[in-house]
């Protein structure tokens, strides 16, 4: 539908509160360094303008596109050149190039201070004093640190954030009530951000077809009773929603997501029996619930796939005349039968099937050529199964922290050029696959583990893309979206790496480590472990374990000492010397 004024259309559809929140998110995701007050001012100006367009759609500038309106507004920021450098050059461009330019300057790792959580009483006072500003600040701080956060979902997080403060600031023990809720929101928020970052990377780096294939597989697992045509419609709509959000079109994205939720709930009988509860919820909760809904039961007596995809005389004709439809149907049929497979595995199987048909269909006897295509799937299925089995055994044996350490060593040896903070962050997240997925029964392990690993490895890819240092990382990240994990798994020790020069400063610790939380202390130790491996890539597990055990004992000893700083200084020197000797440095 063409509207005379797009801004008026979206304002009316979304309502003032959501409109303002989404514009704030959009601006904060583009101009990540701008102060909160500046963004609020810009949002208010846009909102006032939108209201004039609602009153009269023919008013001046109301016919302009949202990109033009928002881009013009962002380009009024006085400090653009000194704060953002070359991003200011975007303002010399015309739409749509200007928006593309802004998108290219989004920073996945902005140089922003860590968010420190104030005391509960301080937070509750701020919440009561000015609830609106408090919640806007939440949106702003999350959006600028996560420039690809799924905007309509961030509205849902903000709603839960508000609910937590509304409830807990009245509670007898505010901290006991609030802190677990904030921890949960933080962890869920990080996970949500990372999942959305993979969707955007999929769309931006591998194109719409890659995203659609992912969506066909996932929705077919989730809605196995739905017809292919229904799944295809949902995939088309979902692709539009995510394309918009990843492209910075947050108002359109939120509006279209609401429409999609409405459609799903109006047609739940032909989609899934699991949607009933979701569809009784208010909009934001409803959309979130649908996105997370459990897989429906598979229809009984599904016929063998071989009939349509191997035995039929029309296989090659169907493939050649409409690959998207035929391979889409293959993926749909395979995925709905296999909720026990990861989406990336299903996509690998579909690619193998496609490659086989492309090779065989022009042959003298196509059927003879592709008759055994399903046999080619066996090793592809067994590889992640075996990998997950081995790693879950290792996780159960070591526990999360030591499992993370094993992965830290493994990945530092594979790609030692990658920065230490990135290796620590990524390996810690890879290690969380254990507690997240190994508790599941066999049938749920692979979709949990491998699809989670895809999300984490995408973090490595986007961080590495900002400052590329390893050809091996670039290769694994860019060659194939679905083969990223097998590509990284297959990497051996990088024999070309020249060990890092030893720097005692890297291994000098102070009494401040004693006041850190357990998590922060782990990160310090894991940082030291990565640095050790970078100095001595050929160190054995046993050597590294001995040094790390000594290090843990050293920290524990000095944190109990009366004069902690002296202990760290003196014992630290001894530890460095002993470690050098143990590792032959």
């Amino acid at each position: 539908d063409a509207h005379k004024s797009e801004v008026a259309h979206r304002f009316k559809d979304l309502g003032e509160e959501n409109f303002k929140a989404l514009v704030l998110i959009a601006f904060a995701q583009y101009l990540q360094q701008c102060p909160f007050e500046d963004h609020v001012k810009l949002v208010n100006e846009v909102t006032e303008f939108a209201k004039t367009c609602v009153a009269d759609e023919s008013a001046e500038n109301c016919d302009k596109s949202l990109h033009t309106l928002f881009g013009d507004k962002l380009c009024t920021v006085a400090t653009l050149r000194e704060t953002y450098g070359e991003m200011a050059d975007c303002c010399a461009k015309q739409e749509p190039e200007r928006n593309e330019c802004f998108l290219q300057h989004k920073d996945d790792n902005p140089n922003l201070p860590r968010l420190v959580r104030p005391e509960v009483d301080v937070m509750c006072t701020a919440f009561h004093d000015n609830e609106e500003t408090f919640l806007k600040k939440y949106l702003y701080e999350i959006a600028r640190r996560h420039p690809y956060f799924y905007a309509p979902e961030l509205l849902f997080f903000a709603k839960r954030y508000k609910a937590a403060f509304t409830e807990c600031c009245q509670a007898a023990d505010k901290a006991a009530c609030l802190l677990p809720k904030l921890d949960e929101l933080r962890d869920e928020g990080k996970a949500s951000s990372a999942k959305q970052r993979l969707k955007c990377a999929s769309l931006q780096k591998f194109g719409e077809r890659a995203f659609k294939a992912w969506a066909v597989a996932r929705l077919s697992q989730r809605f196995p009773k739905a017809e292919f045509a229904e799944v295809s419609k949902l995939v088309t709509d979902l692709t539009k929603v995510h394309t918009e959000c990843c492209h910075g079109d947050l108002l359109e994205c939120a509006d279209d997501r609401a429409d999609l939720a409405k459609y799903i709930c109006e047609n739940q009988d032909s989609i899934s029996s699991k949607l009933k509860e979701c569809c009784e919820k208010p909009l934001l909760e409803k959309s979130h619930c649908i996105a997370e809904v459990e897989n429906d039961e598979m229809p009984a007596d599904l016929p063998s796939l071989a009939a349509d995809f191997v035995e039929s005389k029309d296989v090659c004709k169907n493939y050649a005349e409409a690959k998207d439809v035929f391979l889409g149907m293959f993926l749909y049929e395979y995925a709905r039968r296999h909720p026990d497979y990861s989406v990336v595995l299903l996509l690998r199987l579909a690619k193998t099937y496609e490659t086989t048909l492309e090779k065989c269909c022009a042959a003298a006897d196509p059927h003879e050529c592709y008759a055994k295509v399903f046999d080619e799937f066996k090793p592809l299925v067994e590889e992640p199964q075996n990998l997950i089995k081995q790693n879950c055994e290792l996780f159960e044996q070591l526990g999360e922290y030591k499992f993370q350490n094993a992965l830290l060593v493994r990945y530092t040896k594979k790609v030692p050029q990658v920065s230490t903070p990135t290796l620590v962050e990524v390996s810690r997240n890879l290690g969380k696959v254990g507690s997240k997925c190994c508790k599941h029964p066999e049938a749920k392990r692979m979709p949990c583990a491998e699809d989670y690993l895809s999300v984490v490895l995408n973090q490595l890819c986007v961080l590495h893309e900002k400052t590329p240092v390893s050809d091996r990382v670039t290769k694994c990240c860019t060659e194939s979206l679905v083969n990223r994990r097998p590509c990284f798994s297959a990497l051996e020790v990088d024999e070309t790496y020249v060990p890092k020069e030893f720097n005692a400063e890297t291994f000098t610790f102070h009494a401040d480590i004693c006041t850190l939380s357990e998590k922060e202390r782990q990160i310090k130790k894991q940082t030291a472990l990565v640095e050790l491996v970078k100095h001595k890539p050929k160190a054995t597990k046993e050597q590294l374990k001995a040094v790390m055990d000594d290090f843990a004992a050293f920290v524990e000893k000095c944190c109990k000492a009366d004069d902690k700083e002296t202990c760290f200084a003196e014992e630290g020197k001894k530890l460095v010397a002993a470690s050098q000797a143990a590792l032959g440095l």
Partner: antibody
Framework: EVQLLESGGGLVQPGGSLRLSCAVS????????INWVRQAPGKGLEWIGI???????FYATWAKGRFTISRDNSKNTVYLQMNSLRAEDTAVYYC???????????????WGQGTLVTVSS | DIQMTQSPSSVSASVGDRVTITCQSS???????LSWYQQKPGKAPKLLIY???KLTSGVPSRFSGSGSGTDFTLTISSLQPEDFATYYC???????????FGGGTKVEIK
């Protein structure tokens, strides 16, 4: 040495028909897919259609109905039957092999030298 | 409707120059089904590159292809006298019936 050799071109009146041949030597045609591609004087390349080793054919949307591709593996020859010819069908017609290992990709690794078809009254 | 747009339509260059030819497709080609051909006057086309970036055997390494989806590039790193010719991109799509060539780029001597 593998060779593809087109023949059968010439002058034909509008509305007329013509059958082009593509004789293949140096390889067993029965294992390969063959395409027909044309090029109007001073213009670019235009894909007409393909015949797979199995005999299955596909055509460009514009060519469906008027053009028919067939093969005779015993003669190691592929044919292009053209009906209801028009002035705009005037072109050099090439046969070309699809690169082995592909079926629908536009990778044509062996070409004939082409035969000129002129449609004019 | 399938569109395969090649640019520029002609380029004048000297021996040793770096030449870049682009090919834009709408919609995106299927699975990097993108080829590049070289054609000299009165001769049949010759396949240079397939799958967007793979060189066919015997093609000099000064030729390279890149791109994916909708945007592709053929680069000749250092033009040689035998490279003056017309170059075509070819695209394959979801339906084989949509197989299409670009309009061509003539590389001429400056």
């Amino acid at each position: 040495e593998v060779q593809l050799l087109e023949s059968g071109g010439g002058l034909v009146q509008p509305g007329g028909s013509l059958r082009l041949s593509c004789a293949v030597s140096g390889i067993d045609l029965s294992n390969y897919a063959i395409n027909w591609v044309r090029q109007a004087p001073g213009k670019g390349l235009e894909w007409i259609g393909i015949i797979w080793a199995s005999g299955t054919t596909f055509y460009a949307t514009w060519a469906k109905g008027r053009f028919t591709i067939s093969r005779d593996n015993s003669k190691n020859t592929v044919y292009l039957q053209m009906n209801s010819l028009r002035a705009e069908d005037t072109a050099v017609y090439y046969c070309a092999r699809t690169y082995p290992g592909y079926s629908t990709a536009p990778y044509f690794d062996l070409w004939g030298q082409g035969t000129l078809v002129t449609v004019s009254s | 409707d399938i569109q395969m747009t090649q640019s520029p339509s002609s380029v004048s260059a000297s021996v040793g120059d770096r030449v870049t030819i682009t090919c834009q497709s709408s919609p995106s080609v299927w699975s990097n089904f993108l080829s590049w051909y070289q054609q000299k006057p009165g001769k049949a086309p010759k396949l240079l590159i397939y799958e967007a970036s793979k060189l066919t055997s015997g093609v000099p390494s000064r030729f390279s292809g890149s791109g994916s989806g909708t945007d592709f590039t053929l680069t000749i790193s250092s033009l040689q006298p035998e490279d003056f010719a017309t170059y075509y991109c070819g695209g394959g799509y979801s339906s084989i019936s949509d197989t299409t060539f670009g309009g061509g780029t003539k590389v001429e001597i400056k």
